[in-house]
């Protein structure tokens, strides 16, 4: 019923490997949905590649892609979210390679945001607070959150901390004295969606007190 | 604002070819689908055929398929509708629409021509 | 292929009255369905979408309903310039489909 594509590309498109991979983002945009898939081959031509999705929709059968540079995505409120929608690599009207995906399992949360570290003197601790626009969402609300921090200098020592809630508190004798810090923070589905990591928040950054001498203190910034 | 003018019908024999034309303006039109919907004198309307956004993919019903050919240029701002093998029952005014949703393939119009009509007589 | 029935052929309503057409589909399309209005020697006018949104600038006064195989356009009160063909159009899957019309006329 539909376009075709000439022969030559045919068989030139069947010596590829059109694996993929693909992650949703419910409620991204107000309440619409967003789709994102892209080639695990980066050198994959996709000159004449569609991607396309059948099953799972409310209003259509199918849906076709948006090309936007090595990317394809749709944002759209149709999606059932009951089901496995089947993906699908076109070439016209042929398809290439097919997955069949529940897209309530491919979850990737939002980057958490407004990340801050605040130092009580009294209680020597610090307080770390972010904040997620999961929480005013209706679907994705549960999340797990991964907490990293690192002294500045450790290149690749990173410290994990895993909550659920969007606060946690560090002791002020687990860290370095006088030392520069770098901490983030990334989410995951962690209630009936399944999925992946969000992207990390944006870093920030706090120096820890000096120890006082008289006291084996650290002293406040 | 958005504008679609069709042009190119007129009267031609059974067995004839035709080429209609949609010059549209006040959009991105390789961010659409298009489609082809005729009407004939004093009936309802009819789907044609849908091109979409990238030009790669086609649709027809079974009525024309293999006897009309959509095209488009989203340089040139137009859409083209080939048809041969022209029958009786093909005349109708034939409308250029586009769907209100962008990209993705979500099928009913927001704007449409004035239309072109296509007489197929002897 | 899905088959659009629409009923009745004709309407025949007073101003000020309302107007209920009806669409049925002969497979299920969830929501996948549209209305449109049309005028002697005009294109196609859409009203209604997703089987129940109502298109910018439509007044409210139009309504449409249903999902599945059962579909609705309901004119609360019929204004002289509401008389005309009306056509449900169903986008669910290829072929598009479009209903044979109701013909909405001045009692």
């Known amino acids: 019923e539909s376009g075709y594509a000439q022969n030559g590309d045919l068989e030139d498109a069947e010596l590829d490997d059109y694996s993929f991979s693909c992650y949703s983002q419910l409620e991204v945009n107000g309440s619409q949905h967003s789709l994102t898939c892209a080639f695990e081959d980066p050198d994959v031509n996709i000159t004449n590649l569609e991607f396309e999705i059948c099953g799972a929709l409310v209003e259509v059968k199918c849906l076709n892609f948006r090309k936007l540079q090595e990317i394809y995505f749709i944002e759209t409120k149709k999606f059932l979210l009951i089901g496995k929608s089947n993906i699908c690599v076109k070439v016209g009207e042929k398809s290439l390679t097919c997955k069949k995906i529940d897209l309530t399992t491919i979850v990737k949360p939002e980057a958490p945001f407004d990340l801050s570290v605040v130092y009580r003197e009294g209680a020597n601790d610090f307080v770390v607070t972010f904040n997620t626009s999961h929480l005013q969402k209706k679907y994705v609300k549960v999340l797990m959150h991964d907490v990293a921090y690192r002294q500045e200098k450790d290149e690749n020592k990173w410290t994990h901390v895993n909550l659920s809630s969007t606060k946690l508190t560090l002791l002020q004798r687990k860290l370095q004295p006088a030392a520069m810090y770098e901490i983030k923070v990334r989410s995951i589905p962690d209630h009936y969606f399944k999925g992946f990591w969000s992207e990390w928040s944006p870093s920030y950054y706090f120096r820890t007190p000096e120890i006082n001498n008289s006291s084996g203190e650290m002293d406040p910034i | 604002q958005v504008q679609l003018v069709e042009s190119g019908g007129g009267l031609v024999k059974p067995g004839g070819s035709l080429r209609l034309s949609c010059a549209v303006s006040?959009?991105?039109?390789?961010?659409?689908?298009m489609a082809w919907i005729r009407q004939a004198p004093g009936k309802g309307l009819e789907w044609v055929s849908t091109?979409?956004?990238?030009?790669?993919?086609?649709y027809y019903p079974d009525s024309v398929k293999g006897r009309f050919t959509i095209s488009r240029d989203n340089a040139k701002n137009s859409l083209y509708l080939q048809m041969n093998s022209l029958r009786a029952e093909d005349t109708a005014v034939y409308y250029c629409?586009?769907?209100?949703?962008?990209?993705?393939?979500?099928?009913?119009?927001?704007?449409w021509g004035q239309g072109t009509l296509v007489t197929v007589s002897s | 292929e899905i088959v659009m029935t629409q009923s009745p052929a004709t309407l025949s309503v007073s101003p000020g009255e309302r107007a209920t057409l009806s669409c049925r589909t002969s497979?299920?399309?969830?929501?996948?369905l549209a209305w449109y209005q049309q005028k002697p020697g005009q294109a196609p006018r859409l009203l209604i979408y997703?089987?129940?949104t109502l298109h910018i600038g439509i007044p409210a006064r139009f309504s449409g309903s249903g999902s599945g195989t059962e579909f609705t356009l309901t004119i609360s009160s019929l204004q002289s310039e509401d008389f005309a063909v009306y056509y449900c159009?169903?986008?669910?899957?290829?072929?598009?489909?479009f209903g044979g019309g109701t013909k909405v006329e001045i009692k």
């Open positions: 629409a586009r769907p209100l949703s962008a990209h993705y393939g979500f099928n009913y119009f927001d704007y």
């Open positions: 006040g959009f991105t039109l390789s961010d659409y689908y």
């Open positions: 091109i979409s956004a990238s030009g790669l993919r086609t």
């Open positions: 497979e299920d399309i969830y929501q996948g």
């Open positions: 997703s089987a129940n």
């Open positions: 159009q169903q986008y669910y899957d290829y072929p598009l489909a």
